[in-house]
């Protein structure tokens, strides 16, 4: 886990102050408003998760 001001999070993750850890950019599909998703902006946007088929 990354502490603020140290080495960046690993590829595919971004620092979350809310969670106090590196968080997976993949989760921005389901929770696009998460605080760390701005740091994931380099990744192409994915469609939002369907609740039901």
């Amino acid at each position: 886990e990354q502490a603020p001001g140290t080495a960046p999070c690993s590829r595919g993750s971004s620092w979350s102050a809310d969670l106090d850890k590196c968080a997976d950019c993949a989760s921005c599909r389901a929770r696009p408003h998460s605080d760390f998703c701005l740091g994931c902006a380099a990744a192409p946007p994915a469609p939002f998760r369907l609740l039901w088929p």
Epitope: G12, D18, D24, A26, S27, R29, A30, R49, L51, P53
Partner: antibody, heavy 119, light 111 residues
Framework: EVKLGESGGGLVQPGGSMKLSCVAS????????MNWVRQSPEKGLEWVAE??????????HYAESAKGRFTISRDDSRSSVYLQMNNLRAEDTAIYYC??????????WGQGTSVTVSS | DIVLTQSPASLAVSLGQRATISCKAS??????????MQWYQQRPGQSPKLLIK???KLDSGVPARFSGSGSGTDFTLNIHPVEEEDTATYYC?????????FGGGTRLEIK
């Protein structure tokens, strides 16, 4: 250290009711969706219900098998999640686990509480 | 609902060898960037534990002996070299949409 403690299981007759509780600690509870998942030899692992956050107006989602009979709720002030189960059937017999998920992964699991529906 | 089919249902692998478990989804659970597939380990008498998320990312504290791969509908969990403590049942789970579903499990025995 993350801790999840389920309770409230036991033996209940068909058609009866039961309320399960889960107390959580060691992670930012108010930021996590909470799930109930059950496990039986017949059906394996089966997702039951999910409750989201205050900012989502505590939106709830249920498996088809739980709709109309089960109600999930949470109390953020107590870092707790509940599952009210009504009109219980023999096929609801299982170990019930609570599990937090930020979005996709069931990051932690409690020890489970056993529910037996039998006459 | 998305159906996840695991194979084999059980396998026995010699200590130090490779265990390979397959999970096939009834529809794609991947975008061009990520795959929404997880793997869990459940040791006898214990609760499930997250091993791998998003098809290939190890959860914190999981040994590098475990690896996951795949996209679309076909996913694989590999364990190499297997150790005694890997005796467990392994489950895949998707998070593409609700309802979340799990595979039927693969029981791994170490010879």
């Amino acid at each position: 250290e993350v801790k999840l403690g389920e309770s409230g299981g036991g033996l209940v007759q068909p058609g009866g009711s039961m309320k399960l509780s889960c107390v959580a600690s060691g992670f930012p509870f108010t930021k996590y969706w909470m799930n109930w998942v059950r496990q039986s030899p017949e059906k394996g692992l089966e997702w039951v219900a999910e409750i989201r956050l205050k900012s989502d107006n505590y939106a709830t989602h249920y498996a088809e098998s739980a709709k109309g009979r089960f109600t999930i709720s949470r109390d953020d002030s107590r870092s707790s999640v509940y599952l009210q189960m009504n009109n219980l059937r023999a096929e609801d017999t299982a170990i019930y686990y609570c599990s937090p998920t930020y979005a996709d992964t069931m990051d932690y699991w409690g020890q489970g509480t056993s529910v037996t529906v039998s006459s | 609902d998305i159906v996840l089919t695991q194979s084999p249902a059980s396998l026995a692998v010699s200590l130090g060898q490779r265990a390979t478990i397959s999970c096939k989804a009834s529809q794609s659970v991947s975008t061009s960037t990520y795959s929404y597939m997880q793997w869990y380990q459940q040791r006898p008498g214990q609760s499930p534990k997250l091993l791998i998320k998003y098809a290939s990312k190890l959860d914190s504290g999981v040994p590098a002996r475990f690896s996951g791969s795949g996209s679309g509908t076909d996913f694989t969990l590999n364990i190499h070299p297997v150790e005694e403590e890997d005796t467990a049942t392994y489950y895949c789970q998707h998070s593409w949409e609700l309802p979340y579903t799990f595979g039927g499990g693969t029981r791994l025995e170490i010879k």
